[in-house]
């Protein structure tokens, strides 16, 4: 648990920038939670560096991270999920830098999945649906979702829609006819827990119908 220097042999190491960031994922593997940390500078020599978390744990003082290439990772049931933990970068027993972090404020949800788009000819709209593993979770159940879509030819012209449900209706008249669209979705905690956007879901591609000249409406696909 020591956060103090035991000797003076690490002066060079102390000149380096050991700033890091972390995110937590709750109930990511059954009832197990995970915590992932990484250095912000990709050029940090991580050879002898370890991460340790102390405090706000169940019946243990501290836990050590596992190193997985450039990231440091813990999977455990032992997060109290209240209050701040002390997360330190260490060389041996010496702490190089520490951060006090409340794991409930750095939650990164799992990416949504099973994104699909169904065209309803009679309603002249597209029903977007997707799934999230968080519907089954005890903790991070309430999410805000960000659905982003674009015409495939418009490289960076994304339209975003925020919603709390897993279903969205896009009106046909708001989309270009006979065009290929890409759509994707991500999630962020929206109640009690705070944190970061999930990774994007895999993209789904759909084509809008042609305009029917006699009625001025789009043809179904």
């Amino acid at each position: 648990e020591s956060g103090y220097a035991q000797n003076g042999d690490l002066e060079d190491a102390e000149l380096d920038d050991y700033s890091f960031s972390c995110y937590s994922q709750l109930e990511v593997n059954g009832s197990q939670h995970s915590l992932t940390c990484a250095f912000e500078d990709p050029d940090v020599n991580i050879t002898n560096l370890e991460f340790e978390i102390c405090g706000a744990l169940v019946e243990v003082k501290c836990l050590n991270f596992r190193k997985l290439q450039e990231i440091y990772f813990i999977e455990t049931k032992k997060f109290l999920l209240i209050g701040k933990s002390n997360i330190c970068v260490k060389v041996g027993e010496k702490s190089l830098t520490c951060k006090k972090i409340d794991l409930t404020t750095i939650v990164k949800p799992e990416a949504p999945f099973d994104l699909s788009v169904v065209y309803r000819e009679g309603a002249n709209d597209f029903v977007v649906t997707f799934n999230t593993s968080h519907l089954q979770k005890k903790y991070v159940k309430v999410l805000m979702h960000d659905v982003a879509y674009r015409q495939e030819k418009d490289e960076n012209k994304w339209t975003h829609v925020n919603l709390s449900s897993t279903k969205l209706t896009l009106l046909q008249r708001k989309l270009q006819p006979a065009a290929m669209y890409e759509i994707k979705v991500r999630s962020i905690p929206d109640h009690y827990f705070k944190g970061f956007w999930s990774e994007w879901s895999p993209s789904y591609y759909f084509r809008t119908p042609e305009i029917n000249n006699s009625s001025g409406e789009m043809d179904p696909i």
């Epitope: 648990e1 020591s2 956060g3 103090y4 102390c54 405090g55 706000a56 744990l57 169940v58 019946e59 243990v60 003082k61 501290c62 109290l80 999920l81 209240i82 209050g83 701040k84 002390n86 006090k100 409340d102 005890k138 903790y139 009690y192």
Partner: antibody, heavy 119, light 105 residues
Framework: QVQLVQSGAEVKKPGASVKVSCKAS????????MNWVRQAPGQGLEWMGL????????SYNQKFKGRVTLTRDTSISTAYMELSRLRSDDTAVYYC????????????WGQGTTVTVSS | EIVLTQSPATLSLSPGERATLSCSAS?????MHWYQQKPGQAPRPLIY???KLASGIPARFSGSGSGTDFTLTISSLEPEDFAVYYC????????FGGGTKVEIK
């Protein structure tokens, strides 16, 4: 103001159980841990365990594990400590104490509940 | 489990004198807290995270230390300061020291 009010004194026989309550007011009950600390007559302080009122997760001092059970009722902002298989050396004042999660010290204490174990 | 040893067990001083209370840990501790307890009362927090004054605590109280050695200092004792003082480690299992009684000489 922030307050913790504990239930009254108890007299129990060896082998029995006791359940002490701690009613919180003046703050968001689910935002802080509730800790239990005991003090035998003329002795020091001994941490027994804590509960996270938000999710019911508990952490116990190994010395008491298996004998102490911490629970809470969020609807009435009340925490409970039950100690079973009582012995005479469990005679003590039992305190509930709010845990400040930023610094992990006990910033608000109940008035204490005296539990006497005697045959 | 870390053992916290407080010394001296009893400190006999007069009002106006300086009190220095020690807390020694059996292994390194990141943060230490201090509490005051008067007879028949619950403990009350004095100092948290080594040197930060708890709410409502006068500035004559101060804390210092690192690693295994921590100190609570009362710069000039007031009559209401005669009590028992406990140190406590910040992390599981939140161990308390045995206490130092500050009594009137």
């Amino acid at each position: 103001q922030v307050q913790l009010v504990q239930s009254g004194a108890e007299v129990k026989k060896p082998g029995a159980s006791v359940k002490v309550s701690c009613k919180a007011s003046g703050y968001t009950f689910t935002g802080y841990t509730m800790n239990w600390v005991r003090q035998a007559p003329g002795q020091g302080l001994e941490w027994m365990g804590l509960i996270n009122p938000y999710n019911g997760v508990t952490s116990y001092n190994q010395k008491f594990k298996g004998r102490v059970t911490l629970t809470r009722d969020t609807s009435i902002s009340t925490a409970y400590m039950e100690l079973s298989r009582l012995r005479s050396d469990d005679t003590a004042v039992y305190y509930c104490a709010r845990g400040d999660g930023n610094y992990w010290y006990f910033d608000v204490w109940g008035q204490g509940t005296t539990v006497t174990v005697s045959s | 489990e870390i053992v916290l040893t407080q010394s001296p067990a009893t400190l006999s001083l007069s009002p106006g004198e300086r009190a220095t209370l020690s807390c020694s840990a059996s292994s390194s501790v990141t943060y230490m807290h201090w509490y005051q307890q008067k007879p028949g009362q619950a403990p009350r927090p004095l100092i948290y995270e080594i040197s930060k004054l708890a709410s409502g605590i006068p500035a004559r109280f101060s804390g210092s230390g690192s690693g295994t050695d921590f100190t609570l200092t009362i710069s000039s004792l007031e009559p209401e300061d005669f009590a028992v003082y406990y140190c406590q480690e910040w992390n599981y299992p939140y161990t308390f020291g045995g206490g130092t009684k500050v009594e009137i000489k």
